[in-house]
Interface confidence: medium
Amino acid sequence: ATKLTEEKYELKEGQTLDVKCDYTLEKFASSQKAWQIIRDGEMPKTLACTERPSKNSHPVQVGRIILEDYHDHGLLRVRMVNLQVEDSGLYQCVIYQPPKEPHMLFDRIRLVVTKGFSGTPGSNENSTQNVYKIPPTTTKALCPLYTSPRTVTQAPPKSTADVSTPDSEINLTNVTDIIRVPVFN
């Protein structure tokens, strides 16, 4: 079995998480991809997904989450803007490949969001303010209505690097919903 590893991001409220998930180019370029949160003892919850088939370099925005799939480079870019403390948690990228269960991309992201603005460790201040300009070409995509029961149902033990975070609910709604968070102008 592949060892589940995590990479930790410590960011301040209002900043932007900006990560990439690499995938096998030939196999998954046009497959639909999703960004999920994993809570202890629960099924992974899909927060946003690309279109089906996934379009090249075409931003998809779901609330505060923006996905961009770069087919030529075999990577999915995920941005979570205007971060809130409640966004803290464990996240992962997956590739939908029905009827098979979703394919998880390594590594998982352990996000820790703390109060108070700081210019680091995210991007420069101009791109981490509370208002984030979204390209006008962004679209929304409906995510599949299933989560495989055989996907990991419990988060792995936290790595020694982790900072414990409260188990408060993240205001991002349920697994199959389009996230109802205001879109910034």
Epitope: D18, V19, K20, D22, T120, S123, A161
Partner: antibody, heavy 125, light 107 residues
């Protein structure tokens, strides 16, 4: 195999700016982080920040946040580091280096495996 | 910021000796640690990544171990070309801080 070639040595006055370039040849440029690291005389290595050219969003160490600008031009496969409001303490050798691992996160690199030859910046009045 | 503390700061040894350099992080960094060798006038060279993985092309006499906060770099049998300054670097969280370095000199 990627190679990183940096611009030549610079001598600058206090208060001025310097812009160092780092051109990649061979290998992949766009999706790996290009980091900037400096070493002042008699001092250790200091990580300044990094950028993934494809994304264009830089990341800075806090002590440089207000003075450094890291950019990249995919078309010329070149990364740049500009440092403003130069002080004598900024006299150092500046290196660009490529992170070699994929991983999930934006700045994941599992170490810096390819380095430029270094650019000496001297700040003196 | 995560502080990285190396010990010793300098070390004298002879060819053939077994040498160990330690690096301690101010907080847990899992296995997100790299080791570099740096010689005057040259660019640093990556030796070890992910705490214990040997970088391609690096001699097997170099090895790394540890996780969490305590890490070691071991050179099993010193060769003349190994005399240099060694740095650890964490990349668990920003900024990706280096240790202050360990200068390895000929006895």
């Amino acid at each position: 195999q990627v190679q990183l070639v940096q611009s030549g040595a610079e001598v600058k006055r206090p208060g001025s700016s310097v812009k160092v370039s780092c051109k990649a040849s061979g290998g992949t440029f766009s999706i790996y982080v290009i980091s900037w690291v400096r070493q002042a005389p008699g001092q250790g290595l200091e990580w300044m920040g990094g950028i993934i050219p494809l994304f264009g969003t830089p990341n800075y160490a806090q002590q440089f946040q207000d003075r450094v600008t890291i950019t990249a031009d995919e078309s010329t496969r070149t990364a740049y580091m500009e440092l403003n409001s130069l002080k004598s303490e900024d006299t150092a050798v500046y290196y660009c280096a490529r992170g070699h691992g994929p991983g999930s996160s934006h700045y994941s690199y599992y170490g810096l495996d390819v380095w430029g030859q270094g650019t000496t910046v001297t700040v003196s009045s | 910021d995560i502080q990285m503390t190396q010990s010793p700061t300098s070390l004298s040894a002879s060819v053939g000796d077994r040498v160990t350099i330690t690096c301690r992080a101010s907080q847990g960094i899992s296995s997100w640690l790299a080791w570099y060798q740096h010689k005057p006038g040259k660019a640093p060279k990556l030796l070890i990544y992910a705490a214990s993985s040997l970088q391609s092309g690096v001699p097997s006499r170099f090895s790394g171990s540890g996780s969490g906060t305590d890490f070691t770099l071991t050179i099993s049998s010193l060769q003349p070309e190994d005399f240099a300054t060694y740095y650890c670097q964490q990349y668990n969280s920003y900024p990706y801080t280096f240790g202050q370095g360990t200068k390895l000199e000929i006895k």
